[in-house]
């Protein structure tokens, strides 16, 4: 014969947002106040995480899911639910160990975060130079030399202009 | 629970030296890098200065570099920052923030802060 799950265990029809209280005959009790059960049948709730120094609450706690924090201004998340908070830099930096750093002569970043990458060669596609990269942003790679002048056979791509100012790390 | 306090701030006049100190409780210390952060009035967080595990690589911002040593002592749970030759530019708040554990991927990287600690150059 057939036993139903509730018979089996009288905690399985505690809902999300109770606890199945053992101090009070397995009766099913709301979670206390910072705290949370996401699934029925639970013997205990989960503590709220708390956002704290740099992390800001996203989503506050309920007896039903976790809050959910991101990073105050000036930091983005990182990690599995926003687990640690990195520094931001600016357009055209990557973070190093050393802090912010300029991306060097040939990459560039157009984000806050993330590393330097190495500026697109426009050459491997058969095409030239249309816009010159800068530390914040990509070349734009334009037609190939031979669309430009008909009947010419090859010509090189011009090559970047140098930054004034700027030199490699 | 997991909790870093710092110490030492205060009122200085420019020239003149401070060290700062962070003790922290309720984590392996010695597992992780620590980080010194800094927020001057109406400004944003900014990072000044982070130490490895064992104290072996420290890294500070531009403009502290020179005047400002990172250090630690895994023994007592303490992180510090002796500052010297302090400037009116340094006016701050100081947080210690703990850092990654080597496996995070990023030196930079926080999710436990102290409360602050206040420092005023001024004459």
């Known amino acids: 014969f057939e036993r139903t799950r509730s018979l089996q265990d009288p905690c399985s029809n505690c809902p999300a947002g109770t606890f199945c209280d053992n101090n009070r005959n397995q009766i099913c009790s709301p979670c206390p106040p910072n705290s949370f059960s996401s699934a029925g049948g639970q013997r205990t709730c989960d503590i709220c995480r708390q956002c704290k120094g740099v992390f800001r609450t996203r989503k506050e706690c309920s007896s039903t899911s976790n809050a959910e924090c991101d990073c105050t201004p000036g930091f983005h998340c990182l990690g599995a639910g926003c687990s640690m908070c990195e520094q931001d830099c600016k357009q055209g930096q990557e973070l190093t160990k050393k802090g912010c750093k300029d991306c060097c002569f040939g990459t560039f970043n157009d984000q806050k975060r993330g590393i330097c990458r190495p500026w697109t060669n426009c050459s491997l596609d058969g095409k030239s130079v249309l816009v010159n990269g800068t530390k914040e942003r990509d070349v734009v790679c334009g037609p190939s030399p031979a669309d430009l002048s008909p009947g010419a056979s090859s010509v090189t791509p011009p090559a970047p202009a140098r930054e004034p100012g700027h030199s490699p790390q | 629970e997991v909790q870093l306090v710092e110490s030492g701030g205060g009122l200085v006049q420019p020239g003149g030296s401070l060290r700062l100190s962070c003790a922290a409780s309720?984590?392996?210390?010695?597992?992780?890098?620590m980080i010194w952060f800094r927020q001057a009035p109406g400004k944003g967080l900014e990072w000044v200065a982070n130490?490895?595990?064992?104290?072996?690589?420290?890294y500070y911002v531009d403009s502290v570099e020179g005047r400002f040593t990172i250090s630690r002592d895994n023994a007592k749970n303490s992180l510090y920052l002796q500052m010297n030759s302090l400037r009116a530019e340094d006016t701050a708040v100081y947080y210690c923030?703990?850092?990654?554990?080597?496996?995070?991927?990023?030196?930079?990287?926080?999710?436990?802060w102290g409360q602050g600690t206040t420092v005023t150059v001024s004459s």
């Open positions: 130490i490895n595990q064992d104290g072996s690589e420290k």
């Open positions: 309720g984590f392996t210390f010695s597992n992780y890098w």
């Open positions: 923030a703990r850092g990654g554990d080597g496996y995070s991927g990023s030196h930079h990287g926080t999710d436990v």
